[in-house]
């Protein structure tokens, strides 16, 4: 083993000292004879020491001893001691007691042999072992007077060699992280939690991070264990953006031919069944009714026009029932109903006319008479010298129950080229021209059009009481929706519990997977805010898709175009959710088509209005929007504009 130079010399010096020892003792005896027992001169002292440095050191001090104790001849013991100590420069010891191993007397000098860790002439200077190669320590070197020691950083312990360090595995202690996962790290450890949770060192547990406090969402934020979801005001036409935090407009992804014809009159605008047009004709000259117009519809039932006086006098109503023209008339209190002619709800234009002749009424379709009814009286009724006639289009001026035979007055139909009493009609034309809601779509197909701005609702019952009385009633919700969407987000079908302001069930289009936070076009089936099943759909392809939903005790399925959707809940969760749904179904619920009422955005996965074509079948019964308890006036019940042809 090689030692540093200084240490080597320190190691060797004691050996040298031992070699001089015999010589030193002889010198001491010689000094006794020459200068203690006798008075010696400098030259005699030189003979004792045999060198000048020691002599030069000794002689002045020798004279001091004489001065102090008297000459040798006085035989003062103090003198002998004084002189005997002079040649030993280590007496008194000039070296630092703590740092010196030995003091070596030299010729007029001395040498302090230092202990390990000390240095300097007097061995009073601490050697900083840490300054060179960290004192051989792997991590921390602690210098201290005459020594040093190694130590380790927190999380490490000193090895048996006193110099190297080894990592402490804190995770070996099961209590290190409490409920959290423990991960050992070099010199440390980390308590890990799942995403969305943060470690609480006080509780030694993972606690949910409330991301909503961080203001991550643009609109509504809902915190959940380990996660959060942002919601946008769907009813306001907004949906989540790509970043799943901000909101953006729900824009049509399929262009529909929604252009309107300014020369047409839409009859289905007023859901209340009240007329879209009310005209009053007054004449001094007795006049007969003549009405002619072009008409187009897919609707099987509704009122085209009313002409006459008040409900108890004389009037006629031209209507559609089962797709055929029906004429209801009341003359002087006597009512009749006549139906004849071809099915005309085929969606193509045809010319219809009503003409009052001397003793009969003639109804024509495309100039062919389909009805000729004998009547006794005139529709224009005299009053205070003037003849009066009220004419209403698309409804009647009294309640439909007061008709000869009740009928649903709502008619999704279109009129053009109308002519009332052979007169030019600038009034209606001017009104229609400035009011697009009074105009019809230029082109329509079968179906119902939801414009993305409203809904319809029905009061339907989903509980079924079995024939054998006394047994528990069962429930069933089966929905078949034929859809041709124009936008990627919107409620197709939903149940709403008004008393609880909850959404027990919803089927909707959505463009993201909320838990995976992934943009994807899906159909979602949900009970309240919990998604039960999801299924991918090519929503913006302009094609018709069939969405089928079936829920009954113990099962829930979602299918899109015959392919079954993915369940999003466990079997136990499904049962719990279906139990919630059943509880709702036992109370009054309303059935919504195309949207939801003003509910909190967190009530259901989607709250936006549906935009596009859709027909709904609920529990094997086709829903007729004319039969709804309420329908937004912009929803067309029996017609839908086609998808715009792709630009060449």
């Amino acid at each position: 083993a090689l030692l540093p130079a200084r240490e080597a010399t320190q190691f060797l010096r004691p050996r040298q000292r031992r070699a001089f020892q015999v010589f030193e003792e002889a010198k001491q005896g010689h000094l006794e004879r020459e200068c203690v027992e006798e008075l010696c001169s400098r030259e005699e002292a030189r003979e004792v020491f045999e060198n000048d440095p020691e002599t030069d050191y000794f002689y002045p001090r020798y004279l001091d001893c004489i001065n102090k104790y008297g000459s040798p001849y006085t035989k003062n013991s103090g003198f002998a001691t004084c002189v005997q100590n002079l040649p030993d420069q280590c007496t008194p010891n000039p070296c630092d007691r703590k740092g010196t191993q030995a003091c070596q007397d030299l010729m007029g000098n001395f040498f302090c042999l230092c202990k390990a860790g000390w240095g300097g002439r007097l061995c009073d200077k601490d050697v900083n072992e840490c300054s060179q190669e960290n004192g051989g320590c792997l991590q921390i070197c602690h210098n201290k007077p005459g020594s040093f020691h190694c130590s380790c950083h927190s999380g490490f312990e000193l090895s048996s060699d006193g110099r190297t360090c080894q990592d402490i595995d804190e995770c070996a202690d099961s209590e290190a992280c409490g409920e959290a996962r423990c991960k050992n790290l070099p010199g440390s450890y980390s308590c890990l939690c799942d995403e969305g949770f943060a470690y609480s060192s006080q509780e030694k547990a993972c606690r949910d991070v409330d991301e909503c406090l961080q203001g991550r969402c643009e609109q509504v934020c809902v915190n959940s264990p380990g996660s959060y979801t942002c919601h946008c005001d769907g009813r306001g036409g907004l949906k989540l953006s790509q970043d799943m935090d901000t909101c953006e407009d729900i824009l049509p992804c399929v262009p529909f031919s929604v252009a309107k014809s300014v020369k047409s009159l839409y009859l289905g605008r007023m859901f209340s069944g009240t007329p879209v047009i009310r005209l009053r004709f007054k004449r001094l000259q007795p006049t007969r009714l003549v009405a002619e117009f072009d008409f187009r519809t897919f609707d099987p039932e509704g009122i085209l026009l009313f002409a006459g006086g008040h409900q108890d006098s004389t009037w006629i109503v031209l209507a559609l029932r089962a797709g055929r023209l029906e004429l209801q008339l009341r003359y002087n209190g006597v009512g009749r109903v006549t139906s004849s002619g071809p099915v005309i709800n085929h969606g193509m234009w045809q010319t219809i006319s009503v003409e009052e002749l001397a003793r009969n009424l003639v109804i024509k379709v495309n100039r062919d008479a389909v009805m000729k009814i004998a009547v006794a009286g005139d529709l224009f009724q005299p009053e205070r010298g003037l003849y009066h006639l009220n004419l209403t289009v698309g409804g009647i001026p009294f309640h439909e129950k007061d008709l000869v035979q009740p009928i649903n007055p709502r008619l999704d139909g279109c009129m053009r080229s109308w002519n009332w009493l052979n007169g030019e009609d600038t009034t209606i034309q001017e009104t229609v021209k400035v009011n697009t809601r009074m105009q019809c779509f230029s082109v329509t197909e079968r179906g119902s059009f939801y414009p993305g701005s409203g809904f319809a609702f029905y009061s339907l019952d989903y509980m079924r009481t079995p024939l054998d009385v006394g047994t528990e009633s069962t429930w069933e919700v089966e929905v078949v929706a034929h859809i041709r969407p124009a936008a990627d987000t919107g409620v197709l079908f939903a149940l709403w519990a008004p008393d609880l302001r909850a959404v027990p069930l919803s089927v909707a289009l959505v463009d993201y997977h909320s838990t995976k936070k992934l943009k994807k076009q899906l159909v979602v089936l949900a009970v309240e805010h919990t998604a039960l099943a999801l299924m991918e759909i090519k929503v913006c392809d302009g094609q018709e898709h069939v969405v089928t939903v079936s829920l009954r005790d113990g099962e829930a399925t979602l299918e899109v175009d015959g392919t079954r959707g993915q369940s999003e809940v466990s079997a136990a969760q499904l049962q719990e959710r279906l139990a919630v749904l059943e509880r709702h179904l036992r109370s009054p619920v309303l059935t919504f088509a195309g949207g939801l009422p003003d509910v909190p955005v967190t009530s259901a996965p989607v709250t936006a209005f549906y935009r596009g074509c859709m027909t709904l079948e609920v529990n094997r019964r086709l829903l007729d929007l004319d039969e709804a308890a309420y329908k937004h006036s912009d929803i067309t019940a029996h017609s839908c504009p086609p998808v715009e042809p792709a630009a060449a």
Epitope: R280, F281, K282, R283, L284, Q285, P286, T287, R384, G385, L386, L421, N422, G423, E424
Partner: antibody
């Protein structure tokens, strides 16, 4: 387009007669009655009555019974107003107006001046 | 016979002013009131027909209100072309009767 065009101004002496015309176009003449309205200089409007264009039967208000006669020629879709034994107070503008219970379409008016 | 009392007989207004003309009938005529505008040397023009209905092409500054026996015709902000004489006409019963007229002049 409905048009009612009246004959030109007339200057007559008291005791004379005058017959003014109102030619209708742009609609079926017999579907609407024809009204006559008088407006004396600086005065308001007075309804004189009307004629049934189907039957030719006239109806006069009390004030205009006697010297005033409404007539028709359906072949030329024209209605006439004749005033006999003219008086100075007959000086007025006479308007024809199509019957719609109220008056939407008017002739431009014919000024009849009775002056000696 | 239903008589109509129209007031005022004349009024002077500035452009932009609101004008209100009333017509009171001697019998209840429901809402069978009509309002006409007449300019010198011209035939009257129908502005408002029965049921307080604004006729096609008539500016929306003109309006009619009332039913029964009390009727009001309003010009919300008079324009230079509105200076004329205005008449009410009842078409509830024969004989048809006009109001005496209201002349709206420039102040």
């Amino acid at each position: 387009q409905v048009h009612l065009v009246q004959s030109g101004s007339e200057l007559k002496k008291p005791g004379a007669s005058v017959k003014i015309s109102c030619k209708a176009s742009g609609y079926t003449f017999t579907n609407y009655g024809m009204n006559w309205v008088r407006q004396a200089p600086g005065q308001g409007l007075e309804w004189m009555g009307w004629i049934n264009t189907n039957t030719g039967e006239p109806t006069y208000t009390e004030e205009f019974k006697g010297r005033f006669v409404f007539s028709l020629d359906t072949s030329v879709t024209t209605s006439y107003l004749q005033i006999s034994t003219l008086k100075a107070e007959d000086t007025a503008v006479y308007f024809c107006a199509r019957d719609e219970g109220w008056f939407v379409y008017w002739g431009q008016g014919t000024l009849v001046t009775v002056s000696s | 016979e239903t008589t109509l009392t129209q007031s005022p007989s004349s009024l002077s207004v500035s452009t932009g002013d609101r004008v209100t003309i009333t017509c009171i009938t001697s019998t209840d005529i429901d809402d069978d009131m009509n309002w006409y505008q007449q300019k010198p040397g011209k035939a009257p023009k129908l502005l408002i027909s029965e049921g307080n209905t604004l006729r096609p092409g008539v500016p929306s500054r003109f309006s009619g209100s009332g039913s029964g026996t009390d009727f009001t015709f309003t010009i919300s902000s008079t324009q230079p072309e509105d200076f004329a004489t205005y008449y009410c006409l009842q078409t509830d019963s024969v004989p048809l009767t006009f109001g005496q007229g209201t002349k709206v002049e420039i102040k």
